[in-house]
Interface confidence: low
């Protein structure tokens, strides 16, 4: 009895060659082998036949059905299909007649797989309203030229959307399959969804799932897309952009931006206004929600408002917001005295530093960077020549950095001179010798600056030189004589307010001794 070894199912990728095997079992010297095709009408046209005689196979091709490239039989009677096409998906019947051994027949089913092209998606480019109470068309997905027909699934933020195929107000999908001229299948799926506000940030895409030989599967994802949604305003924010301090102050002269944002889409129109005496002073109407105040002045302090002109908003939504613009300023400081204050020695005075500013400025007085006290009043009592110098009133706004001012005055103390004297290399009484050299130093201060003079110019007085803290010094270098010992030398400091004198004495002066 003749038996056939024919695989019941053969799978091949489109474009590849496939060989359908039909091998009789056992040894048969002479048999007839035929290949038939089962077409859609149920007819079985004969494709090829072969006669085995001994070890040689005589092949005859019958009806190639216009296939290109045509069917072929190889030397073992196997049916060869080069470049498999979708149209080759048929049942192929092999019949072997082996005389007395009988006749056998077997069928091979050929499945041809085609991977579809890249998945394409066409999103709805319009503006979709979340206020629609039924599903709206979201996008159409196309998977072209596959075999068998692919399946399409939809995804939101990477999560598969479980939508029915029946119309539904919450969402559904429709599908349509088309057989192309090539025999390949194309699938179009359209997604409909009822949209919500959180869909504004959602990422959507579709994927085509297709079959491959040996039960394997593939997936081709489309690019992702986002939707343009129309949703009403629910919240409005209105704030001072930059620059403003943590306490909410802006500096006079700064350019200030007031920023208003509603969370509706598309961006509604904003009306920016100032409230004065319960009247709206409309400053600007725009789509950005920005109001720029260039070189802001203290007169622009007050209540500013922003209104979102969104007619789709719910009745209970507060579409207006206001804020207080607080403009900080600091005017130049004014002193109760002029730039120079001239006072007599030992007198007293009070100097007032006036300031206008907002928020309330802090005042402090300094002299030579040394703090003298806080507040507007500077009290000067029993002034001395050490009180001479420059006094600074500093104003600052603690809550507004970089906004500060200073004003200063110079104090000149009027008085008769003070005198300080010194001897360089002084000697105790009785230790001076005739001809010893000595340098005398006389320092004075007062206002106006005192003149220094010496009672005897037998020596060489140096030019008076100004020193620190208003002192003027003069030095005189001379040789000690017995006449000096008798009379002494005086230094005198004088100015219009009086004079002071100091007499240098040398005691006993010994005569010069000759050296051995």
């Amino acid at each position: 009895e003749v038996r056939l070894s024919v695989p019941p199912l053969v799978e091949v990728m489109r474009g590849k060659s496939v060989i359908l095997d039909c091998t009789p079992t056992g040894t048969h010297d002479h048999y007839m082998l035929e290949w038939f095709l089962t077409d859609r009408s149920g007819a079985r046209p004969r494709l090829a036949s072969a006669e085995m005689q001994g070890s040689e196979l005589q092949v005859t091709m019958h009806d190639t059905r216009g296939r290109s490239p045509p069917y072929q039989l190889d030397s073992q009677g196997r049916l060869v299909l080069a470049e498999a096409q979708v149209g080759d998906e048929r049942d192929y019947v092999c019949v072997v007649r082996a005389g007395a051994a009988g006749t056998a027949e077997a069928t091979a089913r050929l499945n041809v797989f085609a991977k579809p092209e890249a998945t394409e998606v066409s999103p709805n480019k319009g503006t979709l309203s979340v206020m629609e109470d039924s599903a709206q068309e979201i996008a159409t997905c196309n998977s072209r030229n596959g075999n068998p027909a692919p399946k399409i699934t939809w995804y939101r933020n990477g999560q598969r959307l479980e939508v029915p195929v029946e119309m539904n107000p919450e969402g559904y999908m429709t599908s349509r399959t088309v057989r192309e001229a090539s025999g390949l299948l194309s699938l179009t799926s359209t997604l409909y969804l009822r949209l919500r506000k959180d869909d504004r940030d959602a990422s959507f895409h579709c994927a085509a799932h297709y079959s491959l030989p040996e039960g394997r599967h593939g997936r081709l994802d489309s690019p992702t897309f986002h939707l343009t949604l129309h949703y009403p305003t629910e919240h409005v924010q209105f704030w001072v952009g930059s620059p403003s301090t943590p306490a909410g102050w802006v500096r006079e002269g700064d350019t200030v931006q007031l920023l208003c944002r509603g969370d509706g889409s598309p961006s509604p129109e904003y009306t920016l206004f100032r409230l004065q005496d319960e009247q709206e002073e409309v400053l600007n109407v725009n789509l950005e929600g920005n109001l720029t105040l260039e070189g802001v002045t203290r007169g622009q302090s007050g209540t500013y408002g922003c209104r979102v002109e969104d007619y789709d908003a719910a009745d209970d939504v507060q579409l207006s917001k206001t804020l207080e613009l607080r403009v900080a300023y600091l005017d130049p400081l004014e002193l109760s005295e002029g730039k120079v204050l001239s006072l007599p020695l030992n007198s007293s005075a009070v100097v007032n530093c006036s300031v206008h500013g907002l928020p309330t400025p802090a005042l402090r007085w300094t002299k030579d960077s040394t703090p003298l006290g806080d507040g507007p009043m500077l009290s000067l009592s029993s002034i001395t020549f050490d009180s001479n110098g420059t006094y600074v009133c500093e104003a600052s706004l603690p809550t507004v950095p970089v906004l500060s001012r200073t004003q200063n005055f110079t104090l000149l103390v009027q008085g008769s001179p003070e005198l300080k004297t010194a001897e360089i290399e002084p000697k105790a009484d009785g230790s001076w010798r005739e001809g010893d050299e000595v340098t005398l130093i006389c320092s004075a201060r007062g206002h106006p600056d005192p003149k220094l003079s010496w009672s005897q110019l037998g020596g060489s007085p140096a030019e008076p030189i100004p020193g620190r803290q208003g002192w003027v010094s003069s030095s005189l270098t001379l040789k000690v004589t017995s006449a000096l010992s008798r009379d002494g030398i005086s230094c005198e400091a004088s100015n219009p307010h009086g004079n002071k004198r100091h007499v240098f004495h040398f005691g006993t002066v010994s005569p010069q001794t000759s050296q051995a």
Partner: nanobody, 125 residues
Framework: QVQLVESGGGLVQPGGSLRLSCAAS????????MSWVRQAPGKGPEWVSA????????SYADSVKGRFTISRDNAKNTLYLQMNSLKPEDTAVYYC??????????????????WGQGTQVTVSS
């Protein structure tokens, strides 16, 4: 700082035309309404015309309605006043002014905070 510089004034015969220009700098021109104001010799200032920030809305004093046209070019930061059918009573110094719109009830006012130096327009035969 805000600067407004007018030009285009001059001597013109009654029935003639002039076009005034105002070059603006020192502020965001496209964010503000603008006005033209004039002052005749020995008289107080008189508001002439205003235009909103985008240029889509204009208003005029009754005395110039139908003869004067206000316009602006935000790309060039420039305000214009086209004056046709000029009359001797239009003689004045014309000032361009940074402005805004105030609604009190149903009446719109056009207060100004900065004016230019002005350009003289003289209408005489």
């Amino acid at each position: 700082q805000v600067q407004l510089v007018e030009s285009g004034g001059g001597l013109v015969q009654p029935g003639g035309s002039l076009r005034l220009s105002c070059a603006a700098s020192g502020f965001t021109f496209s964010s503000y309404a603008m006005s033209w104001v004039r002052q005749a010799p020995g008289k107080g200032p008189e508001w002439v015309s205003a235009i909103n920030s985008g240029g889509g809305s204009t208003s005029y004093a009754d005395s110039v309605k139908g003869r004067f046209t206000i316009s602006r070019d935000n790309a060039k930061n420039t305000l214009y006043l086209q004056m046709n059918s000029l009359k001797p009573e239009d003689t004045a110094v014309y000032y361009c002014a940074k402005s805004w719109t105030v609604r009190i009830g149903q009446i719109y006012h056009h207060p100004t905070d900065y004016w230019g130096q002005g350009t003289q327009v003289t209408v005489s035969s």
